[in-house]
Interface confidence: medium
């Protein structure tokens, strides 16, 4: 027999997902008595949050289940779960188990651009000029697609002068210069760049959006017949 | 560099309350859980409790009663608060990194641990 | 909670010698879902704070000289030094993390002669 177990859930999920099976043997007969009968029951849960009745268990299949909504890997990823198995159908002998539930993370935080608003100045004729590094925060698990970034300008770019990739590592947004700036035609850009996660959002999050306004500086160019 | 740095009384008296502050920099407590752990003198390691980056807690059973961890983000600090000490709380007080904030990273392994202060219970 | 229990409780060795700690788990800390075993050893120096040298029983942590070895599984795992360095005077600790509260052993000490 086991004494601890492990299972996982998806966080969010609604009321009645299962979760993870539990099982206690008996030697005794259970066909013509109710000795060999088990009965399954959740004695505590720890910790308590949001509250003590997140699970139950069904007595007679040792199948755990999500009773309660908000569960939360941010804020709790993994729960322990003391079990009782008692025979003959719940009025014998007790054994305990203990049962630890994961909490896997969903995408249920949107990255958010910290600062919001950024200015930065980039010589003309420059191709592939870094212009800005943008950060965002995401309370998602690190290096997981619920937390890597994909950036897009959303506006402002009208000459098609700008790209942005995401830094692997750090997260940030790389925004560069596709194209030379001409500080003749146009000597300011604002833009606007939002972000998304690379896992699509599992409920509707706000998106954010960062505001990046880029000061083309004039070179000295030779004069042209 | 990631660090971690703890702060605390030094001293307690038998029945009074212990609080001590782990003050982190190098990485942000909303991606990584810290551990607190203590070591009585010349003995071993015992863990005590875990704070999620949440704000979520797991805690020793056997202290559970006796303790409190919280966080403060913003000022990259995690507080212990343990009441109701006796002679037997004195050890050496640990916070600990954990490696990640996801199973797969091994996140129950603390990959960082600061230097440790030293609580003395005594009247 | 699980018990860790750890052997032998001291050893002294030799620069240059192969050295093997033990620590036993009292139930399997295998996952069967992921396979993986739920265990970490740390290295704590005298005065100083536990490092950690092996996480999920066998995985290397960044910058470990590649002398320190995990192995096992279920419940029985072993902590290998292959060629013992005067710097590895330590205590060594296993501790599980399968299930709540994490536990350590008591310690293997290793004395250079």
């Known amino acids: 027999t086991q004494d601890t177990f492990r299972g996982s859930v998806l966080e969010g999920v609604l009321p009645g997902t299962s979760v993870m099976q539990v099982t206690a043997t008996d030697e005794d007969d259970a066909i013509y008595t109710y000795n060999g009968v088990v009965a399954y029951s959740i004695h505590s849960q720890e910790p308590k949050d949001p509250h003590d009745l997140m699970f139950t268990i069904h007595r007679s299949t040792g199948t755990i289940s999500v009773i309660s909504s908000g569960l939360d890997r941010e804020k709790v990823p993994e729960y322990t779960l003391t079990i009782q198995a008692t025979d003959m159908d719940g009025d014998g002998s007790t054994t305990t188990a203990v049962a630890v539930v994961e909490i896997l993370d969903a995408n249920d935080n949107a990255p958010m651009f910290d600062p919001q608003k950024y200015e930065a100045h980039v010589p003309e004729n420059a191709v592939g000029h870094e212009v800005q590094r943008l950060t965002v925060t995401d309370l998602d698990a690190p290096n997981s697609p619920a937390w890597r970034a994909t950036y897009l300008i959303m506006g402002g770019d009208d000459g098609d002068h700008f790209t942005i990739t995401t830094h692997p590592e750090s997260n940030q947004g790389i925004l560069t210069t596709r194209k030379g700036l001409d500080f003749e035609a146009k000597n300011q850009h604002t833009l606007y760049v939002e972000v998304t996660n690379e896992a699509p959002f599992v409920l509707k999050l706000p998106t954010s959006t960062a505001t990046i306004v880029v000061h083309v500086e004039d070179v000295n160019e030779a004069p042209v017949f | 560099v990631q660090l971690l740095e703890e702060s605390g009384p030094g001293l307690v008296a038998p029945s009074q309350s212990l609080s001590i502050t782990c003050t982190v920099s190098g990485f942000s407590l909303t991606s990584y859980p810290i551990n607190w752990v203590r070591q009585p003198p010349g003995k071993g390691l015992e863990w005590l409790g875990v704070i999620w980056t949440g704000g979520g807690t797991n805690y020793n059973s056997a202290l559970k009663s006796r303790l409190s961890i919280t966080k403060d983000n913003s000022k990259s600090q995690v507080f212990l608060k343990m009441t109701s000490l006796q002679t037997d709380d004195t050890a050496r007080y640990y916070c600990a990194k954990s490696r990640g904030v996801y199973d797969f990273d091994g996140r129950g392994a603390m990959d960082y641990w600061g230097q440790g202060t030293t609580v003395t219970v005594s009247s | 909670e699980l018990v860790m229990t750890q052997s032998p409780s001291s050893l002294a060795v030799s620069v240059g010698e192969k050295v093997t700690m033990s620590c036993k788990s009292s139930q399997s800390l295998l996952y069967s879902s992921n396979q993986k075993n739920y265990l970490a050893w740390y290295q704590q120096k005298p005065g100083q704070s536990p490092k950690l040298l092996i996480y999920?029983?066998?995985t290397r942590e960044s910058g470990v000289p590649d002398r320190f070895t995990g192995s096992g599984s279920g419940t029985d795992f072993t902590l290998t030094i292959s060629s013992v360095k005067a710097e590895d005077l330590a205590v060594y600790y296993c501790q599980q993390y399968y299930s709540y509260p994490y536990t350590f052993g008591g310690g293997t000490k290793l004395e250079i002669k």
């Open positions: 999920w029983a066998s």
